[in-house]
Every structure is written in C-alpha cells, then in structure tokens.
Interface confidence: medium
Amino acid sequence: MMTGTIETTGNISAEKGGSIILQCHLSSTTAQVTQVNWEQQDQLLAICNADLGWHISPSFKDRVAPGPGLGLTLQSLTVNDTGEYFCIYHTYPDGTYTGRIFLEVLESSVAEHGARFQIP
C-alpha cells in the first residue's frame, strides 16, 4: 500500500533571466527512493539515480543545475519555461509517486513566489 505523500513548492513564479529551485519532498513512507525524474510535460529535464547520480538531459544541461538535494535549479529562465513540471519518485517497494509544480516566468521585474517551504 502506498502511504507516502509528495510535498512540492506548488505554484511559483520567477523573473525572466533569473533562476528558480524546483523542489519536492516525499514523506510519510519508509520506501527507499531509487530514482527521481524531473520532467516538463513529457520532456526529460534530469534524473537523479541513487546509484548512478545525476543525468541532465541534453536539451537542458546548459542551464540546469542538479540540487539542492533531489531538487533541480533552472537558470537563465525564459517565458517559454512557463508550464508544469513533475517530480517522479521511483521507490521500492511502494512504486511511483508524482508531484506537480507550476512555474510562471514573468517579464516584469517583480515576481512573487507562491507557496514555499523548507526541505529539512
């Protein structure tokens, strides 16, 4: 039975040209995290594998930095980066948990951040 839950940074906004941290946290389960995939729609951004480390997609490696933790830092943001991002936690024995983050990249110089939390 899958008992875990994914907490995410929720809906967030950031300034064009700036950077943002995409962060998810899996809680309420003792399942082992074997891999976390970060995807935008159906496109791979990055993978963090427990045994193999980080793999950044060719499409993003010039402006994606791994971390902090299992999170992902997007740099040099453009308006085209606006959209849904998914953290997909592969765990054993529970299976797959998915979290959703919506990022809005704003042209203006004032970008209000949405829900935020600290990852312990």
Partner: antibody
Framework: QVQLVQSGAEVKKPGASVKVSCKAS????????IEWVRQAPGQGLEWIGE????????YYNENFKDRVTMTRDTSTSTVYMELSSLRSEDTAVYYC?????????????WGQGTLVTVSS | AIQMTQSPSSLSASVGDRVTITCRAS??????LNWYQQKPGKAPKLLIY???SLHSGVPSRFSGSGSGTDYTFTISSLQPEDIATYYC?????????FGQGTKVEIK
C-alpha cells in the same frame, strides 16, 4: 567484452507491428541508456529514442512518439523496441547502441543491426 | 529539431592525403558533437566525442575541432582502411540528430 546482440531480420506487412530485441552483456546493464537508431536503405542515421534499463524511463523522438514503445527485461539484460502501424518507409536497419548515464553523451557500442522490411 | 548539414556528401582522395569534412548545425550546439565512422553493412563506430576527444582505441590520425555552429573532422593521412561513410551527431538538444553523411573513397 561488451556486446549488444540484436534479434534477426523481420518482414512485415503495412499496418503491422514489429518488436526488435537487443541483449546486452559484458557491462553493468543499468548504468547505460539503450538508444535506438535506424537507417533506411542508402540513407543516414535517425534517432528513435532511448530507455534507461534500471528504471524503465524512456524518451522518444517526436516523429515516432505515437508508434514506438521501448521496454526492458532486467532479468535477461534485454531491451525491446516495438514499432506499430508500419509503413513502407519504415523499412530500415534498426540499431541499438549504449550511452553511458552521466554527462558525456555518445554511443560507444552498437548492436549488429536488425533489418526490418515492410512490404505488402 | 537541430539540422546538421555535412559537406561534402562524398569525396575521393589519395592514400596519405589530408581529408577534411565539415558539419554545420542550424543553431549553436556548444561543442556537443560526435563523429562516427560506418563501413558498408556494419554498425557505426564512435571516433570523436565532444568535438575533439578521441575515443579509446581510435588512431590519432583522426581529429575534430570547432565551436558554435561549425565543426570539422580531419583525417591527417588517409589510409585504405578509412574508406567509409562519416557522420556527425549533435547531442546539444533532443532529439539527437545526425548529419547526412560523407562518403570517403580512395582515388
């Protein structure tokens, strides 16, 4: 030594599906993506997609997305590529190749190729 | 998708000649370029990765250079066993794409 051994030649009718296998040996199966590339007669190379055997994560060329499925069997270190709704222009040699998980992306070992002929 | 344009499509040179193949990307690919050799009826073989790094076991007569959108592959002294088709391959952005190939023949 590293080997990628592919299944034998196939002849299919238009509209049918084909499933090509690629059996890996001589290295740690989960540490490398398996790539699929095809080559029509007398033509160049076209990337179809990739799968990471450890997790089953797969990413496809948009040109094939609706017709291709990649799967793996970790117990036999085998990857499968299934292409559906075949048409005559899918006649090609289909290659699997491995790409190391990490930051440099290159296909350092290739299978021998599988000729798929689509003809009525 | 990034288009890779290779030139020439074919060439004929004498043993010992210096051979140069160029590959132009439709947008900057940041040195994320590989070169493969393919002989008739065989799978491609990796020669050069990341623009200029020689893959293990590949003879030093093969080399690569370039930046931005323009890349060059060189055989410093053509040998009979180099008869093959050569492909460039970009991995800057998915989908991975290849040049259309350059067929190298001996005069």
């Amino acid at each position: 030594q590293v080997q990628l051994v592919q299944s034998g030649a196939e002849v299919k009718k238009p509209g049918a599906s084909v499933k090509v296998s690629c059996k890996a040996s001589g290295y740690t199966f989960s540490n490398y993506w398996i790539e699929w590339v095809r080559q029509a007669p007398g033509q160049g190379l076209e990337w179809i997609g990739e799968i990471l055997p450890g997790s089953g994560s797969s990413y496809y060329n948009e040109n094939f997305k609706d017709r291709v499925t990649m799967t793996r069997d970790t117990s036999t270190s085998t990857v499968y590529m299934e292409l559906s709704s075949l048409r005559s222009e899918d006649t090609a040699v289909y290659y699997c190749a491995r790409q190391k998980y990490g930051n440099f992306y290159y296909f350092d070992f290739w299978g021998q190729g599988t000729l798929v002929t689509v003809s009525s | 998708a990034i288009q890779m344009t290779q030139s020439p499509s074919s060439l004929s040179a004498s043993v010992g000649d210096r051979v140069t193949i160029t590959c132009r990307a439709s947008q900057g690919i940041g040195n994320y370029l590989n070169w493969y050799q393919q002989k008739p009826g065989k799978a491609p073989k990796l020669l050069i990765y990341y623009t200029s790094s020689l893959h293990s076991g590949v003879p030093s007569r093969f080399s690569g250079s370039g930046s931005g959108t323009d890349y060059t592959f060189t055989i410093s002294s053509l040998q009979p066993e180099d008869i093959a088709t050569y492909y460039c391959h970009q991995y800057s952005k998915l989908p991975y794409t290849f040049g259309q190939g350059t067929k190298v023949e001996i005069k």
